[in-house]
């Protein structure tokens, strides 16, 4: 074992090339320089180096940076990325975006593994907060990115960046998520005019409240029913079936067809059975005329 | 080294208030979305409030909602929790905490002891 | 509110022994985004609770590989492979799938 430590005459290596792959684990070890790997990083990304010789040249530059890597080694890690855990990104300042993009694209086409879960928290961080050119480029790579961050995390992003969202990235958000994008897309698209303003805060009306329903129900706005269907219940519920109705528009049909499924069961439930009937759609399950309707919310309220 | 250290808890009759603060070092605490979690004396921890990291947002659960206030101070690093109207049940550690980038508690405090007694 | 139980209250080893931890939810913990927000804390005596596991299975920084999490949905599962002296203390499971974030009802490795 003594003597494998030893670089083996004429082996050491001038500069990162094809001619390594040949090398044993423990030649890579005793012949490459680390500071020679580190200003040839970008060269490592065009040698099919196995996985086995990729720790080695790993354990190198952890040798050479135990602190963590500076970003001149960390933009050109290429697939010796793929190799870092988050204890090691930890230990980045990574700042520059083009650093950024270059280590997401060696992860292009996966799921966001923890790495790069990590890499991204470390981004964002250093520079404070989730800006419009940051988040173009996450979304670009993980449509799902800003659904992935917590509604804490979200209650930071500044209503600029809102307009780099596209609907599809808000698919996997849950309520509370949206409940927090929401009044953020509200002051972001404020100047917008009617049906423009419609189009860009309709992905987000699942973290709107009854108020900017009713609101919305005075435009014309035709609403469909897929984006129906995800409006918080509680915000539905207050709505009248004029207002519904006119929230709806043409897709008021639609209703029939979601009549046992939440928000539209609930909110049958808590209409006059009279009001329901104008719709001349069928939906059945409404209070029945004569009945007195408490407010079960104002009561518990008083309280 | 990344620390939080609490400070503020008493011994406070029921209908009082406290003040808790916690002292942030060795991260950039203008960074992170920060916590109040609690140990009751049955072992329980329970969260208690979350505060983004520029302070706009805050976060409770029903049980202290409208009791307790979490802010926090960027220039000072530090994070406090206003607790009014306490309550017997409010008996507990309370610890700072750092809420993470895969939404975990990665760091926390030593806690400062709250008790609620007549 | 999301309940979280957690099985054994209290579970007595020898050092070496595998050590296993059960938790389960009132609901399913897969957030809508497909990430699942099951984590294991463990304070020690006299300590604060520390992070071990995150979303289900990540060992977190410095944590020992014989610790391991496993499970979906509404069941996990904390394994120590080879219980040291160091590991004894409260554990707890925790989600944040759901708001408000709950814990686990905590489990106590002792000594036999």
């Known amino acids: 074992e003594v003597e494998k430590t030893a670089c083996p005459s004429g082996k050491k290596a001038r500069e990162i090339d094809e001619s390594l792959i040949f090398y044993k684990k423990w030649e890579l070890e005793a012949c490459v320089d680390a500071a020679l790997l580190a200003t040839q990083m970008d060269r490592v990304n065009a040698i099919p180096f196995t996985y086995e010789q990729l720790d080695v040249l790993k354990h190198k530059l952890d040798e050479l940076y135990p602190q963590g890597y500076p970003e001149s080694v960390i933009q050109h890690l290429g697939y010796l990325f793929l190799k870092m855990s988050p204890e090691d990104i930890r230990k980045w300042n990574v700042t520059s975006l083009e650093t950024l993009k270059a280590l997401l694209e060696v992860n292009k086409g996966h799921e966001m593994s923890p790495q790069v879960a990590t890499l991204i928290d470390r981004f964002v961080k250093g520079r404070g907060q989730l800006d419009k050119d940051t988040l173009d480029t996450l979304t670009a790579f993980y449509p799902g990115y800003l659904c992935s961050l917590s509604p804490e995390e979200l209650s930071s992003v500044p209503p600029s960046s809102i307009w780099a969202v596209r609907p599809q990235d808000l698919d996997t958000c849950d309520p509370r998520q949206l409940d927090v994008l929401y009044p953020k897309a509200r002051l972001a698209f404020q100047n917008m005019n009617g049906s423009e303003y419609f189009v860009k805060i309709q992905s987000f009306l699942g973290g709107a409240p009854t108020e900017d329903l009713k609101a919305l129900s005075q435009q014309n706005v035709s609403m469909d029913l897929a984006t129906f269907m995800k409006l918080r219940t509680d915000a539905v519920l207050p709505l009248t079936v004029a207002e519904v109705q006119k929230l709806l528009g043409p897709h008021v049909e639609g209703l029939k067809a979601e009549e046992r499924h939440r928000p539209v069961r609930d909110w049958i439930l808590r209409q006059r059975q009279d009001d329901l009937d104008t719709l001349g759609l069928g939906l059945q399950g409404g209070i029945p005329n004569g009945y007195l309707v408490l407010d079960l919310s104002m009561q518990e309220a008083l309280s | 080294e990344v620390m939080l250290v609490e400070s503020g808890g008493d011994l406070v009759k029921p209908g009082g208030s406290l003040k808790l603060s916690c002292a942030a070092s060795g991260f950039t605490f203008s960074s992170y979305a920060m916590s109040w979690v609690r140990r009751t004396p049955e072992k329980r921890l329970e969260w208690v409030a979350t505060?983004?990291?520029?302070?706009?947002?805050?976060f409770y659960p029903d049980s202290v909602k409208g009791r307790f206030t979490i802010s926090r101070d960027n220039a000072k690093n530090t994070l406090y929790l206003q607790m009014n109207s306490l309550r017997s049940e409010d008996t507990a550690m309370y610890y700072c905490?750092?809420?993470?980038?895969?939404?975990?508690?990665?760091?926390w405090g030593a806690g400062t002891t709250v008790t609620v007694s007549s | 509110d999301v309940v979280m139980t957690q099985t054994p209250l209290s579970l007595p080893v020898s050092l070496g022994d595998q050590a296993s931890i059960s938790c389960r939810s009132s609901?399913?913990?897969?957030?809508?985004?497909?990430?699942?927000?099951l984590h294991w804390y463990l304070q020690k005596p006299g300590q604060s609770p520390k992070l071990l596991i995150y979303?289900?299975?990540n060992r977190f920084s410095g944590v020992p590989d014989r610790f391991s999490g496993s499970g979906s949905g509404t069941d996990f599962t904390l394994k120590i492979s080879r219980v040291e002296a160091e590991d004894l203390g409260i554990y707890f499971c925790s989600q944040s799938t759901h708001f408000p974030r709950t814990f686990g009802g905590a489990t106590k490795l002792e000594l036999k």
């Open positions: 609901q399913s913990l897969v957030h809508s985004n497909g990430n699942t927000y």
């Open positions: 979303k289900v299975s």
């Open positions: 505060i983004n990291s520029d302070g706009s947002y805050t």
């Open positions: 905490a750092r809420w993470g980038e895969n939404w975990y508690f990665d760091v």
